[in-house]
């Protein structure tokens, strides 16, 4: 026999208390797939979290975060706090990249700025807190007479900014 | 039952001052951040600062530094939003937040109150 509850359509849940007929989901719920018993509560975007997409009978509303933070994990399950570029977030709120690393988002941490020396090139544009470095040519490849800009030296170890 | 209540809200002339107050009822608040923000009519909701548990490290948006401070009395389960000098942009409803983490990660889990209108208007 095949069970009545395997028609009730997305969107409807199977009354049990009712002959098991397909009712539509109440308001501020949903069922994404057929022959559910019951329906969800339609997730609330509250606080920081903003609506980026209503609830609907068929689908759970999607959250995003409030101007100045960004989501984190699955189903944006946390808004984080934005920072500024070149700059990361640490326990104590957003900190300066330290010298020879940068940032150019607002949000993860700061990376070393590329060594062009390993792959035999030269510093084109230096690093900043905000930018990578830039790799030229190679030092041969340049015409004699011309100059590079000095490499930078290397990067002490990320996490201490200056205060 | 768990819950955040702000108070001290009000209209006030700019360059005046007001103190909000947020008082925990139901749960300690000496063991959470509290963040504040804020929403003016018609506008996204506005992160404006944040007092940690921990050490009572203080975070301000750009803002309102240097006018805005923040401080705790865990005695009295209460945190308050010292605001001076206030501008005619201040205007909106100023909410204060628990979050289950620090001052600079918020989940759905969050306490939240329900919000104080301040206007600041001549």
């Known amino acids: 026999l095949q069970d009545p509850c395997s028609n009730c359509p997305a969107g409807t849940f199977c009354d049990n208390n009712r002959n098991q007929i397909c009712s539509p989901c109440p308001p501020n719920s949903f069922s994404s797939a057929g022959g559910q018993r019951t329906c969800d509560i339609c997730r609330q975007c509250k606080g920081v979290f903003r609506t980026r997409k209503e609830c609907s009978s068929t689908s759970n509303a999607e959250c995003d975060c409030t101007p100045g933070f960004h989501c984190l994990g699955a189903g944006c399950s946390m808004c984080e706090q934005d920072c500024k570029q070149g700059q990361e977030l640490t326990k104590k709120g957003c900190k300066d990249c330290c010298f020879g690393t940068f940032n150019d988002q607002k949000r993860g941490i700061c990376r070393p700025w590329t060594n062009c020396s390993l792959d035999g090139k030269s510093v084109l544009v230096n690093g900043t807190k905000e930018r990578d470095v830039v790799c030229g040519p190679s030092p041969a490849d340049l015409s004699p007479g011309a100059s590079s800009v000095t490499p930078p030296a290397p990067a002490r170890e990320p996490g201490h900014s200056p205060q | 039952q768990v819950q955040l209540q702000e108070s001290g809200g009000g209209l006030v002339q700019p360059g005046g001052s007001l103190r909000l107050s947020c008082a925990a009822s139901?749960?300690?608040?000496?063991?959470?951040?509290i963040g504040w923000f804020r929403q003016a009519p018609g506008k996204e909701r506005e992160w404006v600062s944040c007092?940690?548990?921990?050490?009572?490290?203080?975070y301000y948006a750009d803002s309102v530094k240097g006018r805005f401070t923040v401080s705790r009395d865990n005695a009295k389960n209460t945190v308050y939003l010292q605001m001076n000098r206030l501008k005619p942009e201040d205007t909106a409803v100023y909410y204060c937040?628990?979050?289950?983490?620090?001052?600079?990660?918020?989940?759905?889990?969050?306490?939240w109150g329900q919000g104080t209108q301040v206007t600041v208007s001549s």
């Open positions: 937040a628990a979050p289950q983490s620090d001052c600079f990660h918020y989940s759905e889990n969050d306490y």
């Open positions: 139901g749960f300690s608040l000496g063991l959470y951040a």
């Open positions: 007092i940690m548990s921990s050490d009572s490290s203080a």
